[in-house]
Amino acid sequence: SGVFQLQLQEFINERGVLASGRPCEPGCRTFFRVCLKHFQAVVSPGPCTFGTVSTPVLGTNSFAVRDDSSGGGRNPLQLPFNFTWPGTFSLIIEAWHAPGDDLRPEALPPDALISKIAIQGSLAVGQNWLLDEQTSTLTRLRYSYRVICSDNYYGDNCSRLCKKRNDHFGHYVCQPDGNLSCLPGWTGEYCQQPICLSGCHEQNGYCSKPAECLCRPGWQGRLCNECIPHNGCRHGTCSTPWQCTCDEGWGGLFCDQDLNYCTHHSPCKNGATCSNSGQRSYTCTCRPGYTGVDCELELSECDSNPCRNGGSCKDQEDGYHCLCPPGYYGLHCEHSTLSCADSPCFNGGSCRERNQGANYACECPPNFTGSNCEKKVDRCTSNPCANGGQCLNRGPSRMCRCRPGFTGTYCELHVSDCARNPCAHGGTCHDLENGLMCTCPAGFSGRRCEVRTSIDACASSPCFNRATCYTDLSTDTFVCNCPYGFVGSRCEFPVGLPPSFPW
């Protein structure tokens, strides 16, 4: 679709005569008829296949034609066509004299023709005007013409329809050849696909407008390249969405069970060594001079009772000092100036001479210690209770009060979930890290083997000779209903043939 445009510029008819040579009275009131048609080697009369157009009276005799495209649009003259421009044409321009106001062909005398020109040739679509001048014996016509495409039509022959658009069916403008030119940020055959944010994951991300990166379910991050772990996942990661792969030291479905309490919480104080001993449990091994579950208590150097033979201990900045009782000397009052004659053994201890009476040794009764049996035995000093158990002196013995989850004399044993025999009906109990599991005997099911499931005693087809088998649900045994001619608990014997008993 396009328009053949003809711009009339100047018509010269100096003598004011018609084609017949007869003068116009009073002058030649001139209008034009234009016929555009297909190419003809010799332009002949006939249908104006590409269109016709007529002008009003434009002037008398000789005149210049005003460019009137801004006004009524009469010059240039427009000859629209709704087909592919063939590139060739024939053009006939007739100048006529209008004696009156009626310009219809049938209202004019045939000799009102002033001049007629006919041209043909090639014409490519384009913006440039071709200037031409045709001269006859008495007249001269100067004009220019061109072919341009109608709005939204493009290409060498105005055959390509293209309408710029900016909606969800395309974001483009049209190139001179009618091809689409995508607006920035859009791609695809019809420029309907946005170009996502650079780096946006091809599968896990998408966009509805340029430079955007929207994540598909299960993905996150600016470029949608990070998976979303399982909801509630505490100390875990994922490689695909909704996973929860636990970090080192963590366990459980949500990786929220602490398997490395020592590393995550550093509970042991004062340089103590921490040992993991199960989920959320640990043991601290204290450095000398410290005590307590977490080695948080500083021991006085006198707490280890270094002074012997009843010597009293005094703490000092750089250690301790023993004040020895009469008859003793040495760093720890370990040397005696006494003999058994001085009755040095307290609390019923018995004295034994040594080195020909130069020295002695006390044999202490139970619950007492020291070189003179002067100390009551404190059985907790060696911190014997494991797993944070608390040591209690109980007369002649000691006792460990264990933390929850531990048992044994020294709290050295984890409490077995199986210890209380939770599996019913003879189920076998298995300790697991986070609980227990029961393996049930035949006929029972459920987490604790508490559900009775009847055994189909007939499942093994125990009845012979086409007997019908029935399960006795109360005893989980079977009963065979024998067909005629057979007897026995399994209908295994034919009637008349006594069983051969082995006795």
Epitope: D151, N152, L161, K163, K164, R165, N166, D167, H168, F169, G170, G188, E189, Y190, Q192, Q193, Y206, C207, S208, L214
Partner: antibody, heavy 121, light 106 residues
């Protein structure tokens, strides 16, 4: 051959939400060439475009219905759905789903057979 | 909002030409589609991209679009062409239908 089939309740109470699903067979809803639209036609009246959706989930709605309409897509089921909230008797219509073709410059070459939804208490 | 105006009805004798117009501001700068709808049936696309026919649509259906008016022409109208006809265009991201024209074949 592509076929579209609307499904959903034929009667909805005023102020409630109208819900319809369009199942596409004979072609993938994930084809980047197509948008998937909803159009309605009140009894004895003309066609009204409601909105459409792209397989990525991008939606476009008629401004006259915006705020009440939600269109969603389930590519795994090859379906797209319409929800219209706070309905009144004026929403009584035959509801069509259709395929809008980018190459046809937005023309809808395939339509469902339509389902009549009546809004009444 | 963008509007497309159609005459409510057009009557035509069998074999004659029926022309249905669709007017909208600068409609010629948009792509027009035309749909035929018979009673109790879904609409059928008869013209897209102003003047193109989908496969299966008879040649007697043609379209044009320029200025503010798109036109659907049915040449050699047949009784089976009696139906409602709707024009449609896109205004930004919104689909807009004309009010519809009832074509009666006398």
């Amino acid at each position: 051959e592509v076929q579209l089939q609307e499904s959903g309740p034929g009667l909805v109470k005023p102020s409630e939400t109208l819900s319809l699903t369009c199942t596409v067979s004979g072609g993938s809803i994930r084809n980047s060439r197509y948008h998937w639209g909803w159009i309605r036609q009140p009894p004895g009246k003309g066609l009204e475009w409601i909105g459409d959706i792209y397989y990525t989930g991008s939606t476009y709605y008629n401004p006259s219905l915006k705020g009440r309409v939600t269109i969603s897509v389930d590519t795994s089921k090859n379906q797209f759905s319409l929800k219209l909230s706070s309905v009144t008797a004026a929403d009584t219509a035959v509801y069509y789903c259709a395929r809008e073709d980018v190459i046809l410059r937005g023309g809808s070459d395939y339509w469902g057979q339509g389902t009549l939804v009546t809004v009444s208490s | 909002s963008y509007e497309l105006t159609q005459p409510p009805s057009v009557s035509v004798s069998p074999g004659q030409t029926a022309s249905i117009t669709c007017s909208g501001q600068r409609l010629g700068d948009k792509y027009a589609s035309w749909y035929q709808q018979k009673p109790g049936q879904s609409p059928v696309l008869v013209i897209y991209e102003d003047s193109k026919r989908p496969s299966g649509i008879p040649e007697r259906f043609s379209g044009s679009n320029s200025g503010d008016t798109a036109t659907l022409t049915i040449s050699g109208t047949q009784p089976m062409d009696e139906a409602d006809y709707y024009c449609q265009a896109w205004d930004r991201d919104t689909g807009v239908f004309g009010y519809g024209t009832k074509v009666t074949v006398l």
